[in-house]
Interface confidence: low
């Protein structure tokens, strides 16, 4: 169900607050903003159009509202007059609307507060931090945000102090932040400055693009490595395992068949110490954009179960391809009976089960395109009684 | 919203050349194949090119192979056509075409609304 | 190349009504696309993989086939349904489209 939520629900005068909306529907036209309990375009704020990225003032609009693509509705410099109740209104792709309405309440603004940390430049899963909330004040209730969000339910968060001190143990990553701390008492509240983190990590193991393995000879190779990493990552190339040059992006011109290979980068941390590889074939081919339509040929259709085994063949003139099989729309092989073999060309059953008659296809794709065979019957008979000398019972 | 906006059409001279373009938004461009179809006035689609994802891979029917090329800027998500040794008969709307971003991406996921390209003295 | 040709070139057909659109390849084809097209407007992909119903498009269409021959159905005709429909292959170079079929009101 659509919702909406006020962050804070309690303002100080002066600041802003954020109509956050939860459970939006997927496939939307767009979003519009009320003041008060219903739809009422007298006193419309603001509409947003999904289609265009347009945001539309309307009457109740003070050029202090900002909508976000998510719908939420930011309002800075509030006052008292602002408090009561805001309805958004989401109009889905089958036009059918859907309402929802939150409320905030604005009141005199406390002293701003801030931020003392221990430690602002942690290691990865090493490191703790502790985060307290200044002034100390009576009366006063202490609130975490992270991310602009409330604190999630984590381990690895503890409060303490009431709640004036936020430690974080064994921080990661995505701790940068930006942390806040909020204070209220029931007249009024206020938050921090944001703190973030300088965490250092990595590097993770790095990507190399583009993804196109294929490429034309003549064509120039210009590949780029990327790992995640804080301080940024130093980067190395290999070809084939021969190290080329210490550079984050790899070019080679006008390249033929004899630059398919194994492209290696490697990347460098020297704070953490860590290094990582990634290894892209490169295959410099003439690659056709469609391959051609394969033939399967089996060894024979008929065969007889518990006794006869059968070789199917994927035959096709196309390169730089891959095979896959299929029998009654699931893909093979589907039991240890069903052996493949000769990159895949061929799929062989031994012994034949009754369960293996049916129809049965091959596809071959390579990264453009795939095609697959017309489709081959395999028949499985039983005998009802064994024969002799290829005699049938008298 | 998927958004492909062609420009560069016009009115030529036979022989002459034009440069088309195509911006594109709302999808991440450099992961999927890009096309031009062409529609002379009245009549129906005809295939005039298309290029991979990455730009490695350029394809081109025999009525313009060698007269038409493209090529992308995946940094500016821009596709382009360029039309040298133009003729009458390529006078049509020409279309910009997104293909779906798997590799069996031999259909034209999104067009555009087409720009008018017309050849004559 | 591959030729394909639909049938029939006008269909003449009230609301409400059945319309099968049949689109034939000289050759055996993997797959088939179908655009719909109004005056004015670019093509819209209609169906893709021969049976695939593309994003918006109302479950009164159908597509079916394989081999040469494959059919568009419109179980029952809504106003905004006339246009006119091509089909598509890329099963082998180049890709073709059908001449296309005009569904006009009757």
């Known amino acids: 169900q659509l919702t909406t939520e006020s962050m804070p629900f309690n303002v100080a005068e002066g600041k802003e607050v954020l109509l956050l909306v939860h459970n939006l529907p997927q496939q939307l036209f767009g979003y519009s903003w009320y003041k008060g309990e219903r739809v009422d375009g007298n006193r419309q704020i603001v509409g947003y159009a999904i289609g265009t990225q347009q945001a539309t003032p309307g009457p109740a609009n003070s050029g202090r509202e900002t909508i976000y693509p998510n719908a939420s509705l930011l309002i800075q410099n509030v006052t008292q007059n602002d408090t009561g109740f805001y309805t958004l209104q989401v109009i889905k792709s089958d036009l059918v609307n859907e309402e929802a309405t939150g409320q905030f309440h604005v009141y005199p603004e406390l002293p701003k507060p801030s931020i003392s940390s221990n430690n602002s430049n942690p290691v990865e899963d090493k490191d703790a931090v502790a985060f307290t909330c200044e002034p100390e004040t009576q009366d006063t209730t202490y609130l975490w945000w992270i991310n602009n969000q409330s604190l999630p339910v984590s381990p690895r968060l503890q409060l303490s102090n009431g709640n004036r001190t936020l430690t974080l143990l064994s921080v990661t990553r995505n701790d940068t932040g930006p942390y806040e701390c909020e204070i209220q008492n029931p007249v009024s509240a206020n938050r921090s400055d944001p703190v973030t983190l300088n965490v250092t990590y990595g590097p993770d193991t790095p990507t190399i693009s583009p993804s196109d393995t294929y490429y034309r000879p003549g064509a120039n190779l210009s590949l780029s490595c990327y790992a995640a990493s804080n301080p940024p990552a130093q980067y190395s190339w290999l070809i084939n395992g021969t190290f080329q040059q210490s550079t984050q992006e790899l070019f080679i011109p006008n390249i033929t068949v004899n630059n398919s290979g194994s492209y290696t980068c490697h990347a460098n941390n020297s704070v953490t110490g860590c290094n990582r590889t990634t290894v892209k074939t490169i295959i410099v081919t003439e690659l056709s954009p469609v391959v051609a339509k394969p033939q399967i040929k089996a060894s024979k259709t008929t065969v007889t179960g518990d006794k006869d085994s059968v070789n199917l063949t994927c035959s096709t003139n196309d390169t730089g391809i891959s095979i896959r099989w299929f029998f009654k729309n699931q893909s093979l092989p589907s039991s240890e009976r069903m052996k493949l073999s000769q990159g895949n060309t061929t799929l062989s059953i031994n012994p034949v089960k009754r369960e293996d008659a049916g129809t049965y296809w091959c596809e071959v794709f390579n990264p453009i395109s795939k095609n697959q065979s017309d489709p081959i019957m395999l028949n499985v008979n039983y005998n009802a009684l064994p024969q002799e000398n290829g005699l049938s019972p008298g | 919203e998927v958004q492909l906006l062609e420009s560069g059409g016009g009115l030529v001279q036979p022989g002459g050349s034009l440069r088309l373009s195509c911006a594109a938004s709302?999808?991440?461009?450099?992961?999927?194949?890009m096309s031009w179809v062409r529609q002379a006035p009245g009549k129906g689609l005809e295939w005039v090119a298309t290029?991979?994802?990455?730009?490695?891979?350029?394809y081109y029917p025999d009525s313009v192979k060698g007269r038409f090329t493209i090529s992308r800027d995946n940094s500016k998500n821009t596709l382009y056509l360029q039309m040298n040794s133009l003729k009458a008969e390529d006078t049509a709307m020409y279309y910009c075409?997104?293909?779906?971003?798997?590799?069996?991406?031999?259909?034209?996921?999104?067009w555009g609304q087409g720009t008018l390209v017309t050849v004559s003295s | 190349e591959i030729v394909l040709t639909q049938s029939p070139a006008t269909l003449s057909l009230s609301p409400g009504e059945r319309a099968t659109l049949s689109c034939r390849a000289n050759?055996?084809?993997?797959?088939m696309y179908w655009y719909q097209q109004k005056p004015g407007q670019a093509p819209r992909p209609w169906i893709y993989?021969?049976?695939n119903r593309a994003t918006g498009v109302p479950a009164r269409f159908s597509g079916s086939g394989s081999g040469t021959d494959y059919t568009l159905t419109i179980s029952s005709l809504e106003p905004e349904d006339f246009a006119v429909y091509y089909c598509?292959?890329?099963?082998?170079?180049?890709?073709?489209f059908g001449q296309g079929t005009k569904l006009e009101i009757k």
């Open positions: 290029i991979s994802s990455g730009g490695t891979y350029t």
């Open positions: 050759s055996a084809v993997s797959y």
């Open positions: 075409a997104k293909h779906p971003p798997d590799y069996f991406a031999a259909w034209f996921a999104y």
């Open positions: 993989l021969t049976s």
């Open positions: 598509q292959q890329w099963s082998s170079n180049p890709p073709t």
């Open positions: 709302g999808f991440i461009f450099s992961s999927h194949g």
